[in-house]
């Protein structure tokens, strides 16, 4: 394994981060801040890349399936939590192919730096970001109920994960800003539910002294739907752009696949039909079930040991932070707009302390921000009590879970002995099944002067595809030394977070 120039592997880093984002099923798209380190190894005609990427969460849900560079800046009226991360990534590329990159495995750690960057001295506005987002499920449910009243096609959606919660306190009152994912849970259980997801941003406003969070003075909510089924045309001629179809009083994608049609059969979507979605193809088919088989290019990631899996991560308070890592089919966005105006003109960007009483507890007793050399964590455990957890993604969520014996997957890798297997509030234990490809661990917020602990680098060995010796692992241990010509430069626009990474300045 030889060190390489960080700037020489930028295309691989950008692509790898896209593939990581596509693998995730909750949270926000990572954006590349900097290539912190890069090594490579040539095995026959394959190049193996060992990359360390400094990232920052965007404000776009991973469900949007956007490229991370295409994520628009956030709405300036909403407080935006600053979450940074670092990912260790192993990827491969066939040496003579300019387009073929695969991510073999990755480990990321993330942490909020909002409170560390806060400047509360002279600010009339106080902003808190809450780590224990589950406490605000009631507010999310209330907001979604309101949205359902205005949008009939959301009738069977339920709140899935509460992703971010911010509180803004100022002279005019208190606002809670709640981001959450939703999932379609139709009453009629077909062989496989329509695997339809959405992402909502709710703003709830209260009087200054309000103690009762049940009754906001004002509530604004906007949701987007991301449907893995195709929403395209039958005849290859897109509808006229000047006349978007409207349905249910809000903008929608102009066309959709007809409900429950046999593969390959397509209709034009009638704008006033109730909006239904057909069942998605099996998890690994990625839409190739339609039409004639096609010669496949390389899948963006190697096949997983289970057909669709998720990472669940736990803190001792029982609040789950998990990262689904199923590589499913397309997700096509439709914007839904609530018709209420944002009531307060305040610009909530005065920085802001975290609520330190709601931090996830550290399970092993060691201080979360002591630096573990090379990203290895004491006791061989995952950092901060987070452990990979796998089950069938399609059957998981706010809809009724399947019986335990129904998972598609996975084999033999349980949690470390004596560790919790909780799935979340009110859920029984579920067997651990598989060694999942890729993980994202959320750590407690950083404080001033602290740096982000490095992700683990103890990747299992893997054989390279098309290799002469399939039983011989081809990856070397993840390099621990930093390449001479690394780290790279920070992308413009992110200078304020550089202090939270090790090796802040390029050599």
């Amino acid at each position: 394994v030889s060190p390489t120039d960080c700037s020489a592997v930028e295309p691989e880093a950008e692509k790898a981060l896209d593939l990581i984002n596509k693998r995730r099923r909750d949270g926000y798209l990572f954006q590349l801040l900097r290539i912190a380190d890069a090594h490579l190894d040539r095995v026959e005609n394959t190049t193996v890349y060992y990359l360390v990427l400094d990232v920052q969460e965007s404000d776009c849900s991973v469900l949007s399936r956007k490229y991370w560079n295409d994520c628009e800046p956030p709405d300036s009226r909403r407080p935006s939590e600053i979450v940074i991360g670092q990912c260790k990534v192993i990827a491969t590329r066939h040496s003579h192919e300019s387009q073929d990159l695969r991510v073999i495995d990755f480990n990321c750690t993330t942490s909020s730096v909002s409170s560390a960057l806060a400047n509360t001295k002279d600010s009339p506005v106080l902003i808190d970001f809450f780590e224990d987002t589950e406490r605000y499920r009631k507010q999310a449910n209330k907001a979604l109920e309101k949205y359902k009243e205005e949008n009939d096609d959301f009738a069977s959606f339920r709140v899935d994960r509460i992703e971010r919660v911010a509180r803004v306190r100022g002279g005019e009152g208190t606002g809670y800003f709640v981001d959450f994912s939703v999932r379609n849970c139709p009453r009629h259980h077909f062989p496989r539910h329509p695997n339809v997801f959405g992402f909502c941003r709710a703003d709830l406003f209260y009087d200054v002294e309000a103690l009762d969070l049940e009754s906001p003075k004002n509530l604004v909510i906007n949701c987007e739907v991301f449907d893995p089924q195709e929403h395209e045309n039958i005849n290859g001629v897109p509808p006229h752009l000047g006349h978007p179809f409207h349905w249910g009083g809000h903008e929608r994608s102009s066309t959709t696949k007809p409900p429950f049609k046999p593969h390959g059969s397509r209709d034009h979507h009638h704008p006033h039909k109730p909006h239904e979605h057909g069942p998605p193809p099996p998890p690994d088919e990625r839409d190739h079930s339609h039409g004639p088989p096609l010669p496949q290019g390389p899948p963006p990631l190697l096949p997983m040991s289970c057909s669709s899996c998720q990472h669940a991560t736990f803190g001792t308070n029982g609040a789950q932070r998990h990262s689904h890592n199923n590589n499913s089919s397309d997700l096509h966005p439709h914007k839904h707009h609530s018709h209420e105006q944002h009531p307060h003109g305040h610009h909530p960007h005065a920085h802001h302390p975290h609520e330190h009483d709601t931090h996830r507890q550290h399970p092993h007793g060691h201080h979360p921000h002591g630096h573990h050399p090379h990203g290895h964590h004491p006791h061989g455990h995952h950092p901060h009590g987070h452990h990979p957890h796998c089950h069938d993604f399609q059957d998981y969520g706010p809809c009724d879970p399947p019986p335990h014996n129904q998972g598609h997957c996975c084999h033999g890798h349980g949690p470390p002995p004596g560790h919790l297997r909780r799935r979340g509030p009110g859920k029984g234990p579920r067997p651990f099944h598989c060694r999942q490809i890729g993980s994202v661990y959320r750590l407690p917020p950083l404080r001033k002067g602290e740096v982000l602990p490095l992700p683990e680098a103890n990747f299992p060995s893997f054989p390279l595809p098309h290799h002469k010796h399939p039983l011989k692992p081809d990856n070397q241990p993840f390099p621990q030394s930093v390449s001479e010509s690394c780290p790279g430069k920070f992308k413009s626009g992110f200078p304020q977070v550089s202090m939270f990474f090790t090796h802040t300045f390029p050599k």
Epitope: S7, E10, K15
Partner: antibody, heavy 119, light 106 residues
Amino acid sequence: EVQLQESGPGLVKPSQSLSLTCTVTGYSITSDYAWNWIRQFPGNKLEWMGYISYSGSTNYNPSLRSRISITRDTSKNQFFLQLISVTTEDTATYYCGSASYRYAWFAYWGQGTLVTVSA
Amino acid sequence: DIQVTQTTSSLSASLGDRVTISCRASQDISNYLNWYQQKPDGTVKLLIYYTSRLHSGVPSRFSGSGSGTDYSLTISNLEQEDIATYFCQQGNTLPTFGGGTKLEIK
């Protein structure tokens, strides 16, 4: 190897819509890559128009954003360009192309189709 | 938008010559500079991507170099089949193309 083929009417009237299809063979448009439209005006100037990614997200040239739509039909392994309210300035050879990542580089191109906007 | 300029719009050379075509960007494009060959029939092919990487199937007589704002394409031993127009393109931000350099035989 990825192969792309553009098709559509060669003549469009001003103020109407231009609609083109790109048929991809040798690769599934949902496996990977960004699927782009690029045009070349008389006189050789090339302009990137926009893309639809393998996951279905789109990105357009801001100069065309109010007039352009790129969609796809995965069952036919095709993606489409629609440009509304065309003028004679939209006369060009239209190419579809694949890029590994957004528009970093266009590794494979169709052969191009000439569209003339004229009354 | 980043402007990309190919100052030489046409170039004559003899078979076997070493030919260099240059391209300049209006700001640093972090090596996201690519070169394409367009034949007289309109066919476009990628030659070099990310400044110096040779696309699969492209003869090794083609090479690319540069950094920051200045980049070049070199054909080390000109052959008849290389007669074409060559375009550079930056892909660092919203993609833009140079105006092209038409290569002819002396």
